[in-house]
């Protein structure tokens, strides 16, 4: 951080770290969540053979996980900062119900699952501060989310394991795309 005017620099530890910019803070937060996802994926892959499964399509039909598309303006071709930022925030808000689902899915990584969920809420806050066009951001309907959660929790064990794997994989891909896009902003 900078040395306050009027103060002798010897009073302040050197070298001085500037406070994080909003972009740096967002970048660090996404990486923090990605590290958490890595830990959760390790447990999922150790516990079942879902990570090598070719039957993903069966479970994927039940899920409507957020994905980046050309029209979202987050890819290098056709990049649009405002559209993309809205997509990232909307996507993260849509992922929240799936992160809630993950909360009871881990034995040894219970804390990490909670951390990923909480850190995502913080990330949304950071991004909302950055976004000017907040009107364009639609918040998922709580009733719809509640019934989706009930439906996911009622699946058989195999489908629940597959759902967990797919959520983690999709969330990782979404965050990686977001990270790339945000670095262009």
């Amino acid at each position: 951080a900078p040395v306050p005017p009027g103060e002798d620099s010897k009073d302040v530890a050197a070298p001085h770290r500037q406070p994080l910019t909003s972009s740096e803070r967002i970048d660090k937060q996404i990486r923090y969540i990605l590290d958490g996802i890595s830990a959760l994926r390790k447990e999922t892959c150790n516990k079942s053979n879902m990570c090598e499964s070719s039957k993903e399509a069966l479970a994927e039909n039940n899920l409507n996980l957020p994905k980046m598309a050309e029209k979202d303006g987050c890819f290098q071709s056709g990049f649009n900062e405002e559209t993309c930022l809205v997509k990232i925030i909307t996507g993260l808000l849509e992922f929240e119900v799936y992160l809630e689902y993950l909360q009871n899915r881990f034995e040894s990584s219970e804390e990490q699952a909670r951390a990923v969920q909480m850190s995502t809420k913080v990330l949304i806050q950071f991004l909302q501060k950055k976004a000017k066009n907040l009107d364009a951001i639609t918040t998922p309907d709580p009733t719809t989310n509640a019934s989706l959660l009930t439906k996911l929790q009622a699946q058989n064990q195999w489908l629940q394991d597959m759902t967990t794997h797919l959520i983690l994989r999709s969330f990782k891909e979404f965050l990686q795309s977001s990270l790339r896009a945000l670095r262009q902003m």
């Epitope: 951080a1 900078p2 005017p5 103060e7 302040v12 406070p19 937060q29 923090y32 590290d35 830990a39």
Partner: antibody, heavy 115, light 107 residues
């Protein structure tokens, strides 16, 4: 939340040394980390912080020359090496994730400097 | 180093009371101020960052405000679990500095 577990505290004589460790619950390669201390019945005092790769270290000037911060990302562990300890260094030492403010803290480890 | 002067150092209040704690920085802080709650024998918990943003899962009865050098933490309706010590922290300048704390006790 992400577990940060400090260890290495204990009783040490004035002039002695101690190395505190802070183990993270999972990979913390991309995180700035800090040490914050609290003397018994007193307020919080920032000791210093370290960048993700360990290439930038920021120490509160009052500890320069006596305390050193380091990290081993392969072990997901943060360290605080304290030399020439004084009675006034008696405190609970916390490690915390640093994004300018501290959103995740360890439970703390007590360091007592006494003869 | 930047001084963070917190007041009062302690206060007695009843459940349901509105409580206000202030923090004055010795220089302009650009809203780069956080507030923490600490209970005996526990690590501090982040409540507010950037002067007025509630950390997720922090109850809405906690709010932060302020600008320039002066910042405030308000608890709109004190609950039994809110009896604790509260600290402000500035992160505009190194070294990061904390206020000396405000102990909120039961009247």
């Amino acid at each position: 939340y992400i577990q940060l577990v400090e260890s290495g505290g204990g009783l040490v004589k004035p002039g002695g040394s101690l190395r505190l460790s802070c183990a993270a619950g999972y990979e913390f390669t991309h995180q700035d980390m800090s040490w914050v201390r609290q003397a018994p019945g007193k307020g919080l005092e920032w000791v210093g912080s370290i960048s993700p790769k360990g290439d930038h270290k920021y120490l509160n000037t009052k500890f320069i020359g006596r305390f050193t911060i380091s990290r081993d990302n392969s072990k997901n562990t943060l360290y605080l090496q304290m030399n020439s300890l004084r009675a006034e260094d008696t405190a609970v030492y916390y490690c915390a994730r640093d994004i300018d403010f501290f959103d995740t803290w360890g439970q703390g480890t007590l360091v007592t400097v006494s003869s | 180093a930047i001084q963070m002067t917190q007041s009062p150092s302690s206060l007695s209040a009843s459940v349901g009371d509105r409580v206000t704690i202030t923090c004055h920085g010795s220089y302009w802080l650009n809203s780069e101020v956080a507030w923490y709650q600490q209970k005996p024998g526990k690590a501090p918990k982040l409540l507010i960052y950037d002067a007025s943003s509630n950390y997720p899962s922090v109850p809405s009865r906690f709010s932060g405000s302020g600008s320039h050098e002066d910042y405030t933490l308000t608890i709109s309706s004190l609950q039994p679990e809110d009896f604790a010590t509260y600290y402000c922290q500035q992160y505009r300048y190194h070294p990061y500095t904390f206020g000396q704390g405000t102990k909120v006790e039961i009247k």
